[in-house]
Amino acid sequence: QTSVSPSKVILPRGGSVLVTCSTSCDQPKLLGIETPLPKKELLLPGNNRKVYELSNVQEDSQPMCYSNCPDGQSTAKTFLTVYWTPERVELAPLPSWQPVGKNLTLRCQVEGGAPRANLTVVLLRGEKELKREPAVGEPAEVTTTVLVRRDHHGANFSCRTELDLRPQGLELFENTSAPYQLQTFVLPATPPQLVSPRVLEVDTQGTVVCSLDGLFPVSEAQVHLALGDQRLNPTVTYGNDSFSAKASVSVTAEDEGTQRLTCAVILGNQSQETLQTVTIYSFPAPNVILTKPEVSEGTEVTVKCEAHPRAKVTLNGVPAQPLGPRAQLLLKATPEDNGRSFSCSATLEVAGQLIHKNQTRELRVLYGPRLDERDCPGNWTWPENSQQTPMCQAWGNPLPELKCLKDGTFPLPIGESVTVTRDLEGTYLCRARSTQGEVTRKVTVNVLSPRYE
């Protein structure tokens, strides 16, 4: 009778084991072991027992002890079970960003590992077990579906293998995959709201605001604002689930025409975009042209109003005839026209919006000098010793210099309060002089003596 010890062995892959083959007869003709494994016999006293060291055990094996005794030949098998942890435990790659509400399939692949009967694959979210299955097939594959929720954001998913050899007196061997960190997001189906001027004047600045509600996580949202090829640099303000991106946009003559304003919001692997057109226009203030800004009384003056070729002008509130960018009026300059304002108002329609510009010029009319009865009376009669203010106003542009003299030397104190004396009596020659010429007027002052009763 042949026996083997141990009859069952669990050993790590590549390990060694001592196997004792024994026989019940004292003088066996033959005693040995049959195995493909490298073996080394350890020398022992006696004929009915042999010890072999079996090395580099790579897979399960059943070495067989045999003996040949007088009463016949017999055999005994030992069962070598090799254990080893998997060489690869991996979660199939997934995009890190996943939209909330999507069904996410987690797939774990396990290569190697033995004994398979003791090998379990576990899918986890954090420490929470999602699925536990025995490892079947090569590679073993375990899948589970997760409905992505907002609170899964930042959660780590992993796959763990458990080789449980505790029933065999060994330990529980665990291998864990690299974690997959899930980033969940919500990007609403509504495009971002874009508020901007429909029209923008060359060499001015406008403000563009792009906003969107219902985002998660809002801090991860990227906002791209651009006008044509010009990338804008917005200041982004975040709310709980919203953002508002505000940018200043400057335009030059090169940008003139219709430009595309875009606001793109990128979150996770999705994006939402809003497009709007902005018309960049150039509209200089209209021109008011006077034949001469300063003319003499009686001169013919042409006032012209010229604006942008597509503008419509009014000159002093009167529309151009025909309707268009030019208007003019002719006038003979009178003193009343001095200081008169000529206002040219231009309206330009840009993409349906009306833009208004205005320019005003003043006409200076040179006239005079003038001395007339109304402003410089020719006769004054005042009681002696009374307080009087001689008044004589000369008119003209430029304002004339006025002097009133008696006998070419004695001045009349124009505009000053005086006590009337006999000396004041007489005829004065008032002379108003300016660059426009000179006029004279005689003014007589009569002094009434008091009557004594």
Partner: antibody, heavy 122, light 110 residues
Framework: QSVEESGGRLVTPGTPLTLTCTAS????????MSWVRQAPGKGLEWIGI?????STYYASWAKGRFTISKTSTTVDLKITSPTTEDTATYFC???????????????????WGPGTLVTVSA | GYDMTQTPASVEVAVGGTVTIKCQAS??????LAWFQHKPGQPPKRLIY???TLASGVSSRFKGSGSGTQFTLTISGVESADAATYYC????????????FGGGTEVVVK
């Protein structure tokens, strides 16, 4: 000075229809003209405008559904593919004025036609 | 765009009473605002232009005020003939996609 719409009638859905607005006493080359409609139980809706030079602008809901064009004395509104929702009274209005105090022009519907009724029904 | 928000949507007023209708523009339209009265089967009638100027032939019981973004139409000494729908209309822009009229206010005279 007056404007009058014509061309309103009963049409089947999808049959293009053109309405005409005839201006009298003023020149269309000096004015912008707008089309406005009122559907039963609804408010006034601006459809679009044509400028003195022939540029056109439309309300967002009207874009692609209507086309405005003009001749020297008339302004046309084409309903490209009418639906039952286009049943309404259609008005044309002169939409351009100037303010003598500022000298500026502005949009001002100062002259309206009596309207023309369009019924779209299968 | 220039959104025009009109309030209230409907108002009931007794003969001889006063009614106030407000119109708010989403952006400044200076004084380029008109008020219209619309009765069924008739074209709209312009009552006020340039925010406060009374159109010719319109009763002085109608008064417009405001500038920028806030405008008001006041009808005093209401008569039964004033029963109609009133609309504000901005005169600043006719851009593509523009809002020109307010939503309207129905005035019911008791």
């Amino acid at each position: 000075q007056s404007v009058e719409e014509s061309g309103g009638r009963l049409v089947t859905p999808g049959t293009p229809l053109t309405l005409t607005c005839t201006a009298s006493g003023f020149s269309l080359s000096n004015y912008y003209m707008s089309w406005v409609r009122q559907a039963p139980g609804k408010g006034l809706e601006w459809i679009g405008i044509i400028s003195d030079s022939g540029s056109t602008y439309y309300a967002s809901w009207a874009k692609g559904r209507f086309t405005i064009s003009k001749t020297s004395t008339t302004v046309d509104l084409k309903i490209t593919s009418p639906t039952t929702e286009d049943t309404a009274t259609y008005f044309c209005a002169r939409d351009w004025s100037y303010d003598s105090s500022s000298g500026y022009y502005y949009y001002d519907m100062d002259l309206w036609g009596p309207g023309t009724l369009v019924t779209v029904s299968a | 765009g220039y959104d025009m928000t009109q309030t209230p949507a409907s108002v009931e007023v007794a003969v001889g009473g006063t009614v106030t209708i407000k119109c708010q523009a989403s952006q400044s339209i200076n004084s380029w605002l008109a008020w219209f009265q619309h009765k069924p089967g008739q074209p709209p009638k312009r009552l006020i232009y340039k925010a406060s100027t009374l159109a010719s032939g319109v009763s002085s019981r109608f008064k417009g005020s405001g500038s920028g973004t806030q405008f008001t139409l006041t009808i005093s000494g209401v008569e039964s003939a004033d029963a109609a729908t009133y609309y504000c209309q901005q005169g600043y822009s006719r851009s593509d996609g523009e809002h020109v009229f307010g939503g309207g206010t129905e005035v019911v005279v008791k």
